[in-house]
Interface confidence: low
């Protein structure tokens, strides 16, 4: 049995390329350590798009990933994906995983289908 | 307030089996790991393992592996601990104590269990 | 398995007085999350061990700040800054960081 993890099913990206959503997991454990991965899901595949490890000292993940951002508190993550075009739209999930204090415990999403338009480029002027 | 309440002492036959339990009052049973420890006649404190209440887990030193069983009753928010093929070794003090930041934050009273023939 | 040493068995102290608790694991506590989970707990006759001390330098609720911890890598102490007789008893150092996790063999908290 794995902690249950919720993430809205839709997100509009910004026209800057931009997607936040919120990734919670129950029940909310007195967890010291959690790794939160998110992974984008096309066809039968699953490629990561970034992980990082949360703990009472580090609030703010995504360090090592420029387009990933993210806050934890208690048992919510808020994320933020930027840099986004139309070609990745899809679903993304939200694995969540409570590495300490054992036992080990791990959940996914259900995925949130980030919908990406590119901005209509500016039309030319004679000015 | 949070609160553990074990099984009381038992005497058992060398060879046999007992299984102790703690229930949890005071707080959400399946938010937070259950730990159980053992602490022989005089001597210092050694832990057991842990479970997960909300599903289950466990993690055990190795040195109980075999010895000891922990298992949970969500219903009824207790954790029980069975021992088998006990020895005079098994005799001693089991603690449960539940982790909230730190191990063994609250602990229960004890079960005090006495292997003789 | 990492073996927690508390060299004084018995430390015999004047009430008031301070009283220094050390112990030693025998390879670094610091789990890969960076935090250290040393603990110290007291535990006096007949009675169930109770929490003061958790992560090295963080007192429990309702413990008094007579109650300190200190240390880092490998050496830790327990301090007392006033004893009273309620803290008299057997205190033990924990480590919660690496499986399994150990106990130290205990220091007996004594009245001279």
């Known amino acids: 049995e794995a902690i249950q993890v919720t993430q809205p099913s839709v997100v509009l990206a910004s026209s800057h390329g931009v997607a936040s959503f919120p990734c919670e997991y129950s029940p909310s454990h007195n967890t010291d350590e959690v790794r939160v991965t998110v992974l984008r899901q096309t066809n039968d595949q699953m490629t990561e798009v970034c992980a990082t490890t949360f703990t009472e000292k580090n609030t703010v993940g995504f360090l090592d990933y420029p387009f990933c951002s993210g806050t934890f508190n208690e048992s919510r993550v808020n994320l933020t994906i930027q840099g986004l075009r139309a070609v990745d739209t899809g679903l993304y999930l939200c694995k969540v995983e409570l590495m300490y204090p054992p036992p080990y415990f791990v959940g996914m999403g259900n995925g949130t289908q980030i919908y990406v338009i590119d901005p209509e480029p500016c039309p030319d002027s004679d000015f | 307030e949070a609160k553990l309440q074990e099984s009381g002492p038992v005497l058992v036959k060398p060879g046999a089996s007992v299984k102790m339990s703690c229930k949890a009052s005071?707080?959400?049973?399946?938010?937070?790991?259950m730990n159980w420890v053992k602490q022989s006649h005089g001597k210092s404190l050694e832990w057991i393992g842990v479970?997960?209440?909300?599903?289950?887990?466990?993690s055990y030193n190795q040195k109980f592996k075999g010895k000891a069983t922990l298992t949970v009753d969500k219903s009824s928010s207790t954790a029980y601990m069975e021992l088998n093929s006990l020895t005079s070794e098994d005799s001693a003090v089991y603690y449960c104590?539940?982790?909230?930041?730190?191990?063994?934050?609250?602990w229960g009273q004890g079960t005090l269990v006495t292997v003789s023939s | 398995d990492i073996v927690m040493t508390q060299t004084t068995l018995s430390l015999p102290v004047s009430l008031g007085d301070q009283a220094s608790i050390s112990c030693r694991s025998s390879?670094?506590?610091?789990?890969?999350?960076?935090?250290?989970?040393l603990e110290w707990y007291l535990q006096k006759p007949g009675q169930s061990p109770k929490l003061l001390i958790y992560?090295?330098?963080n007192r429990f609720s309702g413990v008094p700040d007579r109650f300190s911890g200190s240390g880092s890598g490998t050496d830790f102490t327990l301090k007392i800054s006033r004893v009273e007789a309620e803290d008299l008893g057997v205190y033990y150092c924990?480590?919660?960081?690496?499986?399994?996790?150990?106990f130290g063999g205990g220091t007996k908290l004594e009245i001279k």
């Open positions: 104590a539940r982790y909230y930041g730190s191990w063994f934050a609250y």
């Open positions: 005071g707080y959400t049973f399946t938010d937070y790991y």
């Open positions: 479970i997960n209440p909300y599903n289950g887990d466990t």
């Open positions: 390879q670094s506590i610091v789990h890969s999350n960076g935090n250290t989970y």
């Open positions: 992560k090295v330098s």
């Open positions: 924990f480590q919660g960081s690496h499986v399994p996790y150990t």
